[in-house]
Interface confidence: low
């Protein structure tokens, strides 16, 4: 056959559906691929073509579009399944062709089981709310285009098990889920099941997607560094190791990049001849505050080296900071043989 | 105010299973953890639990897994820690203790009760 | 798991004094996740500081918390009468959640 562009697996697209669901799948290629969209391209003439391979198989298939019910048809650049069975988990091709043109890239599709808890092994979007910080929504995702807008769906929210009914501070407001005051308990798998009529049937959607509760914007502070500090005087004798951790504590903010760096007589480590190794640690408390350390390393300091500028900074979209350890030499102790008796005027 | 209120001192011999309620009044019970924590005489606090009761799910210290169970009553808003295969170090008095709201913390704590195992 | 180690075991002061109490931590605890807690004989334990060191509701201010990392800290500025108790530091950052033994203050 001719030459096909062929674009590959689209891994970036791991596509996951739950079994006995509708599932609606565009074609990669106008999204990601192409610079036209669908309809320009068939109003030029191209034809798009489906076909897939099984899990486990090499072999390609075209799709069988003539199943009872019309279980899977496509329309336009979509492949619609009605519902999915645990059997069509495969790879799946959309080819875009006509005599002179082909273009076409493949994708996986994994079907799911849930139970009755909708645990799955579904990977799950995460919706971050800020603790304390008024009314807050999420929408129950990816359920557009599944019906028209003259049909009303019945949509029911579910915490982990759970129907959310009667709960203090949680509202299911049909396609919205209202937090009036979120709260680290607050945090957990929320699911919306959408069920609506179609052509004498009814169908489901399930969505779940976790929430995580972070710290608000209002309590949000400049970075603060725990160590260096006033208390801790970094005292060594030359040819010891040096070690000064850098410990700096971040407020969670939204798309902030949180930054600590040393400076050694105001240069960067990488900058300056001595041999310094740098160690970094990162850990985060429950509301995604993060604390960062920082160990600078010097394995054997040369007197020269104790007499240096050490400074740790740090910075967030909240500010900057920076604080200076506090080095110096070790003064040798005297040895009372020579030293010490010297001054009691032994000679 | 959120206050819990714990069941009776109990007497038990060894083998044998134990259940202690917590129950909560005054204020929402099923989005807080509920977590047990035990204190043997004379000894410190030693933390063996905890289940959130919207969720259902329990959580529990690996030197008791295989011997305690929590579930929680919703309707009642009550809390309960069963350990079973009683030995005698278990004598210990068992607290429940609310996971605080914002502070994850045990900010209110059960009044305590005394479970004493011997033959 | 991370062990959490309290000292001194028992600190003697009178009355007035300032009681400084220690916590080490085994691995580094989210500088969000310590607490302390007072535990008066045949009393259910009380939280005193939650977040290393915010206050609980109703503790009154002579009671700190400080500390990051390993190391942390309980200060009572002036020791009143009923401040003489056991006091234990928790982690709750990390499962399972970890007790220090404590450390008794003690009438001098």
């Known amino acids: 056959s001719e030459r096909c562009d062929d674009w590959g697996l689209d891994t970036m697209r791991q596509i996951q559906v739950f079994e006995d669901e509708p599932a609606r799948i565009k074609c990669p290629l106008f999204e990601h691929f192409l610079k036209f969209n669908y309809s320009t391209a068939h109003s030029a003439g191209l034809t798009l073509i489906w076909y897939w391979t099984r899990q486990d198989r090499d072999l390609e298939e075209p799709i069988n579009f003539r199943l009872p019910e019309n279980r899977i048809s496509k329309e336009k650049d979509v492949l619609w399944f009605r519902p999915t069975l645990l059997n069509d988990t495969g790879n799946y091709t959309c080819m875009l062709r006509n005599t002179t043109y082909c273009s076409k890239v493949a994708f996986p599709l994994e079907v799911v089981q849930k139970d009755s808890c909708f645990n799955s092994p579904m990977k799950l979007p995460v919706h971050k709310l800020y603790i304390e910080y008024g009314i807050q929504r999420i929408t129950c995702p990816n359920v557009d285009g599944y019906f028209p807008s003259s049909v009303k769906p019945t949509i029911t929210w579910y915490m982990g098990c759970y129907k959310i009914q009667n709960f203090n501070n949680v509202i299911p407001e049909g396609m919205n889920l209202s937090f009036l005051i979120a709260l680290i308990s607050n945090n957990g798998n929320y699911t919306c099941v959408v069920t609506y009529p179609e052509n004498g049937r009814t169908f489901h959607l399930t969505r779940t997607l976790t929430v995580k509760v972070v710290g608000s914007p209002k309590n949000a502070v400049p970075p603060v560094i725990h160590s260096p500090n006033d208390h801790v005087v970094y005292e060594k004798e030359p040819g010891e190791e040096l070690l000064i951790p850098c410990t700096v504590y971040f407020s969670f903010l939204m798309d902030s990049r949180n930054e600590v760096w040393w400076t050694i007589d105001g240069k960067k480590p990488d900058d300056i001849t001595i041999d310094v190794t740098i160690n970094e640690s990162i850990s985060h408390s429950r509301t995604e505050d993060e604390t960062r350390t920082q160990i600078l390393s010097i394995k054997k300091v040369t007197s020269e080296d104790l007499k240096r500028s050490y400074v740790c900074h740090a910075r967030s979209a909240k500010g900057e900071v920076a604080k200076a350890a506090k080095v110096k030499q070790k003064v040798p102790a005297p040895r009372y043989t020579v030293e010490l008796a010297c001054g009691f005027g032994a000679t | 105010q959120v206050q819990l209120l714990q069941s009776g001192a109990e007497v038990k011999k060894p083998g044998s299973s134990v259940k202690v309620s917590c129950k909560a009044s005054g204020g929402t019970f099923s989005i807080y953890a509920i977590d047990w924590v035990r204190q043997a005489p004379g000894q410190g606090l030693e933390w063996m639990g905890g289940?959130?009761?919207?969720?259902?799910?329990?959580n529990s210290a690996q030197n008791f897994q295989g011997r305690i169970t929590i579930t929680a009553d919703k309707s009642t808003n009550t809390a309960y820690m069963e350990l079973s295969s009683l030995r005698s170090e278990d004598t210990a008095v068992y607290y429940c203790?609310?996971?605080?709201?914002?502070?994850?913390?045990?900010?209110?704590w059960g009044q305590g009760t005394m479970v004493t195992v011997f033959s | 798991e991370i062990v959490l180690t309290q000292s001194p075991g028992t600190l003697s002061l009178s009355p007035g004094e300032r009681a400084t109490l220690s916590c080490r931590a085994s691995?580094?605890?989210?500088?969000?996740?310590l607490a302390w807690f007072q535990q008066r004989p045949g009393q259910a334990p009380r939280l005193l500081i939650y977040?290393?060191?915010r206050r609980a509701t109703g503790i009154p201010d002579r009671f700190s918390g400080s500390g990051s990392g390993t190391d942390f800290t309980l200060t009572i500025s002036r020791l009143e009468p009923e401040d003489f108790a056991v006091y234990y530091c928790?982690?709750?950052?990390?499962?399972?959640?970890?007790f220090g033994g404590g450390t008794k203050v003690e009438i001098k």
């Open positions: 691995l580094s605890v989210s500088s969000n996740y």
């Open positions: 289940i959130i009761p919207i969720f259902g799910t329990e």
């Open positions: 977040g290393v060191s």
């Open positions: 203790a609310r996971n605080g709201a914002t502070s994850d913390a045990f900010d209110i």
């Open positions: 928790q982690q709750y950052g990390s499962s399972p959640l970890t």
